[in-house]
Amino acid sequence: AWELTILHTNDVHSRLEQTSEDSSKCVNASRCMGGVARLFTKVQQIRRAEPNVLLLDAGDQYQGTIWFTVYKGAEVAHFMNALRYDAMALGNHEFDNGVEGLIEPLLKEAKFPILSANIKAKGPLASQISGLYLPYKVLPVGDEVVGIVGYTSKETPFLSNPGTNLVFEDEITALQPEVDKLKTLNVNKIIALGHSGFEMDKLIAQKVRGVDVVVGGHSNTFLYTGNPPSKEVPAGKYPFIVTSDDGRKVPVVQAYAFGKYLGYLKIEFDERGNVISSHGNPILLNSSIPEDPSIKADINKWRIKLDNYSTQELGKTIVYLDGSSQSCRFRECNMGNLICDAMINNNLRHTDEMFWNHVSMCILNGGGIRSPIDERNNGTITWENLAAVLPFGGTFDLVQLKGSTLKKAFEHSVHRYGQSTGEFLQVGGIHVVYDLSRKPGDRVVKLDVLCTKCRVPSYDPLKMDEVYKVILPNFLANGGDGFQMIKDELLRHDSGDQDINVVSTYISKMKVIYPAVEGRIKFSTGSH
């Protein structure tokens, strides 16, 4: 038998420095977790102790903190090279800065193969990107070889900016011929490494003949066998075993997100490349693991530019940006409008001639807006200012919800109106009218939403049975501020871009902003 140790990360999202337990900014270092310096310590420890080790990443290194905003992927290549990753799969966020923003900082600089079998380049891009990412790679490990085949969410055109010259094929359809090719090359140990979410990971394990192990990402799935070491609740055992259509037991793993854990899977293969056994668990990268001093010193060196960036002007406002709780938790506030407009702007994807855009709606809990910005400081808006408005390091995500769920969410928005609670919703692409004289749960008297399948956008009444796309903070998608109905009833959830980055990009693009209060949220009494 031959034993392989697979170390894996996914959805690191720019968490190069250690973070707090909830993956936000590290405040108390003695209780912080993750970061590449700590990850390196653990990886090196395992490499020294075990003979056949692969370090893999399942995508979405890009996007999530000021590190990505400033360095635009150069930081990913540099520190993944330093950690000596063996392979990476492309995630949807790797396309956030367009194809050029992937090619230059990452594909050209990585000293490891970057993989995706279901992304096919066409037109002028085909020759430009040829060889810079691969469908699969055969890696020598000890005296054996292991085939790694990559895949990426086919929803990427709706989630990021891959442009028109990349075609995202069905994962299973694209993977099978590549796996077959590996088999003809006498590679009998094959790992599918990719970024399409846990449900697709399980389908790949079930349907793609010849795949021995699936290492996934995108859904931030936490798997664990036994007593979990932190706050994350396991979605299943680690590894999650899927019985393939041809009767094999295929281990499927994922390692939550944000570099908080290092996935650790030990696989035993027989001489014909069949998996005999698999076991392991994600390793919590807490402060009991020291940060590697040389990587830490490198991080500190790279940090200097970030500190300078946060005080530079992004754009100007010529109006007061009212992000006060007195406004944003009680009525439409122009800071809420600004943020929602930025959220929609960040998700403009003209992927279908029938639609002016795939999404038109935004909701945002007023309690998530933590500060105003005064225009009397020469109108200057900096990253630092925005960090005071949006201090939680969240993301603005894309969900699909039924109209009935949205109606419940808006009822929840005002179910205890007047107590300065955070659940009061700010909106974009929505006109809502509340009647507070009615009883809680029956206060939404009008709810109109901006059409998407139209050439001239206009507001139509919400249809209860229709499925709508909505941009919202990950906090709401996860049921925060009591929006349990969103968490329980959402039909799809894709994580998006860092909140501050979305707003800063919008302000930089607009240069001068003047958001108004314009009647998105209204109150009526009695007859309407």
């Epitope: 090279n81 330093a82 000596r84 090619i103 230059e104 050209k108 600089e109 990585a110 000293k111 490891f112 193969p113 020759s127 430009q128 990107i129 040829s130 060889g131 810079l132 020598p140």
Partner: antibody, heavy 117, light 107 residues
Framework: QVQLVQSGAEVKKPGASVKVSCKAS????????MHWVRQAPGQRLEWMGN????????KYNEKFQGRVTITVDTSASTAYMELSSLRSEDTAVYYC??????????WGQGTTVTVSS | DIQMTQSPSSLSASVGDRVTITCRAS??????LTWFQQKPGKAPKSLIY???ILLDGVPSRFSGSGSGTDFTLTISSLQPEDFATYYC?????????FGGGTKLEIK
């Protein structure tokens, strides 16, 4: 297949400059960095610098800083290395090499430069 | 700059022999080491990058191992076309630096 064809041998006087070309074929020129390396008689190989053909970004060995200039003509899929203020110790074979995964991987056939008064 | 020390500087062997060449870096270069072959009057030909990954078309009798500061190139069964000079280079950090070479001759 990847081919890097370099210009012919040069004989130069001390103090002069030399410009060596490297024409790439068999791949998309702008997609890969190009290294320049030299091999002087009886000396170990020396890395001179590299260039990103898509944006002209360069990195140079400090030993040659100020004397070496690496450029590209993307329309001709050609990289150039110019070395100025030549001295006798610059007599060497100069190679271009395509960079893959960080490393020089595919090499040109070499250009002999002789510096002699 | 990182110094690369190769040993031996020359060695004699016969067809079918197993041959090992070593390369030592003056500091940790992770796994970012390339081995290449050069025949007299010819361009270098890269064989292995990142310590142990063979470039396309390189015969499987060539293999590499090591990490950190100590690295090895092994030719499991020498063929007549393998007699040449072998070099290592590190690309962990700039400037890229080279070993002094190992001349492999027919015994």
């Amino acid at each position: 297949q990847v081919q890097l064809v370099q210009s012919g041998a040069e004989v130069k006087k001390p103090g002069a400059s030399v410009k060596v070309s490297c024409k790439a074929s068999g791949y998309t020129f702008t997609s890969y960095w190009m290294h320049w390396v030299r091999q002087a008689p009886g000396q170990r190989l020396e890395w001179m610098g590299n260039i990103n053909p898509s944006n002209g970004g360069t990195k140079y060995n400090e030993k040659f800083q100020g004397r070496v200039t690496i450029t590209v003509d993307t329309s001709a899929s050609t990289a150039y290395m110019e070395l100025s203020s030549l001295r006798s110790e610059d007599t060497a074979v100069y190679y271009c090499a395509r960079r893959d995964y960080g490393s020089p991987s595919y090499w040109g056939q070499g250009t002999t430069v002789t510096v002699s008064s | 700059d990182i110094q690369m020390t190769q040993s031996p500087s020359s060695l004699s062997a016969s067809v079918g022999d197993r041959v090992t060449i070593t390369c030592r870096a003056s500091q940790d270069i992770n796994s970012y080491l390339t081995w290449f072959q050069q025949k007299p009057g010819k361009a270098p030909k890269s064989l292995i990058y990142r310590t142990n990954i063979l470039l396309d078309g390189v015969p499987s009798r060539f293999s590499g191992s090591g990490s950190g500061t100590d690295f090895t190139l092994t030719i499991s069964s020498l063929q007549p076309e393998d007699f040449a000079t072998y070099y290592c280079l590190q690309y962990h950090e700039f400037p890229v630096t080279f070993g002094g070479g190992t001349k492999l001759e027919i015994k």
